[in-house]
C-alpha cells in the first residue's frame, strides 16, 4: 500500500474576474484495487448512489477525469447496489483516469479495496481519510474548476510559488 501524493489545483475567479490558482498537497494510499500509476485530470465529484446507474446512454466524459467519491457510513446504505470495488470499476468504465475515495466515514472500505483482486483496474484507485480527506472535500465542495495530480513519489518542490 504505497503512499499516493495528490496535488490539487483550484482555479478560482479573482476580483478582476480572471482565473487565479491555489495549490493544495495531500496524501492518500494506492489501493490494491488499482494500479500504482501517476494520473492527472479535472475532478468530478460522484455520489456513491450516482454510480449505481447502469445507463449506457449516460454521459461518458470525453477526457481524462479524476472521480472523487465520499463514502457514507455503512449503516446509511445497508444494501449497496455495488461494492466499493464495483463503484471504482464503474467510474473507470465511464472514463475516469483515477478514482479517489474518502473513506473517513467508512473505514471498512479500505479492506475491501485492498483485497487481492485477480483483475485489478488499470487506473489508480486511491483512498484518503482524516485531515487529508477534509482538505480534499473542502475543495471539491466549492464546485469550482479543480484538477488533481496523483503521483507515487513526492512532487518536486518549486523554489517559488507564483499566481496568475
Amino acid at each position: 500500500k504505497e503512499t499516493a501524493f495528490v496535488e490539487v489545483v483550484l482555479f478560482e475567479s479573482s476580483p478582476s474576474g480572471d482565473y487565479t490558482t491555489y495549490t493544495t498537497g495531500l496524501t492518500g494510499r494506492f489501493s490494491r484495487a488499482g494500479a500504482t500509476l501517476s494520473a492527472e485530470g479535472e475532478i468530478v465529484q460522484m455520489h456513491p448512489l450516482g454510480l449505481c446507474n447502469n445507463n449506457d446512454e449516460e454521459d461518458l466524459y470525453e477526457y481524462g477525469w479524476v472521480g472523487v467519491v465520499k463514502l457514507e457510513q455503512p449503516e446509511l446504505d445497508p444494501k449497496p447496489c455495488l461494492t466499493v470495488l464495483g463503484k471504482a470499476k464503474r467510474a473507470v468504465q465511464r472514463g475516469a483516469t483515477a478514482v479517489i475515495f474518502d473513506v473517513s466515514e467508512n473505514p471498512e472500505a479500505i479492506d475491501q479495496l485492498n483485497q487481492g483482486s485477480e483483475d485489478p483496474l488499470k487506473r489508480p484507485v486511491v483512498y484518503v481519510k482524516g485531515a487529508d480527506a477534509i482538505k480534499l472535500m473542502n475543495i471539491v465542495n466549492k464546485q469550482k474548476v479543480a484538477r488533481a495530480r496523483i503521483q507515487h513519489r513526492p512532487p518536486r518542490q518549486p523554489t517559488e510559488y507564483f499566481d496568475m
Epitope: 490558482t21 477526457y63 469550482k144 474548476v145 518549486p158
Partner: nanobody
C-alpha cells in the same frame, strides 16, 4: 505546443448576435480551461468567459445573461455565442488555453491571434 485558430468576428449592429469559434491543435491534453478574452482600444485585456473540460463556466459580470460559452472536447473547439451586443463589446477577442505547470507551480496561457468584433450603434 498549442495553436489556436479563431473565426467568427465582424461588424454587427447593436442588439445583434455573433458566434465566435476557436479550434485548438497541437498538445491539447493540457487545455484545462479554454476561454475568451477581449481587449478594447486603450484598455487592458480582460476575461470574457472560460470553460473547463468538465464544462464548468465562468463569465465576466458585464456579459452574464448575454454571452454563452460552450466547448466540444472531441473537436478541441470552444465557442462564444454573443447575443444582445452593445457598442461597449467592441474589442479584439482572443481565444486562450489556460494550463498549469506542476513543476513550477504556475499557470500559463496559450493565445490565439485575435478576431475583431465591432458593434455599431
Amino acid at each position: 505546443q498549442v495553436q489556436l485558430q479563431e473565426s467568427g468576428g465582424g461588424l454587427v449592429q447593436a442588439g445583434g448576435s455573433l458566434r465566435l469559434s476557436c479550434a485548438a491543435s497541437g498538445t491539447i491534453s493540457y487545455a484545462h480551461i479554454m476561454g475568451w478574452y477581449r481587449q478594447a482600444p486603450g484598455k487592458e485585456r480582460e476575461l470574457v468567459a472560460g470553460i473547463s473540460q468538465g464544462s464548468i463556466t465562468n463569465y465576466a459580470d458585464s456579459v452574464k445573461g448575454r454571452f454563452t460559452i460552450s466547448r466540444d472536447n472531441a473537436k478541441n473547439t470552444v465557442y462564444l455565442q454573443m447575443n444582445s451586443l452593445k457598442p461597449e463589446d467592441t474589442a479584439v477577442y482572443y481565444c486562450a488555453v489556460i494550463s498549469y505547470d506542476y513543476i513550477k507551480s504556475v499557470p500559463f496561457r496559450y493565445w490565439g491571434q485575435g478576431t475583431q468584433v465591432t458593434v455599431s450603434s
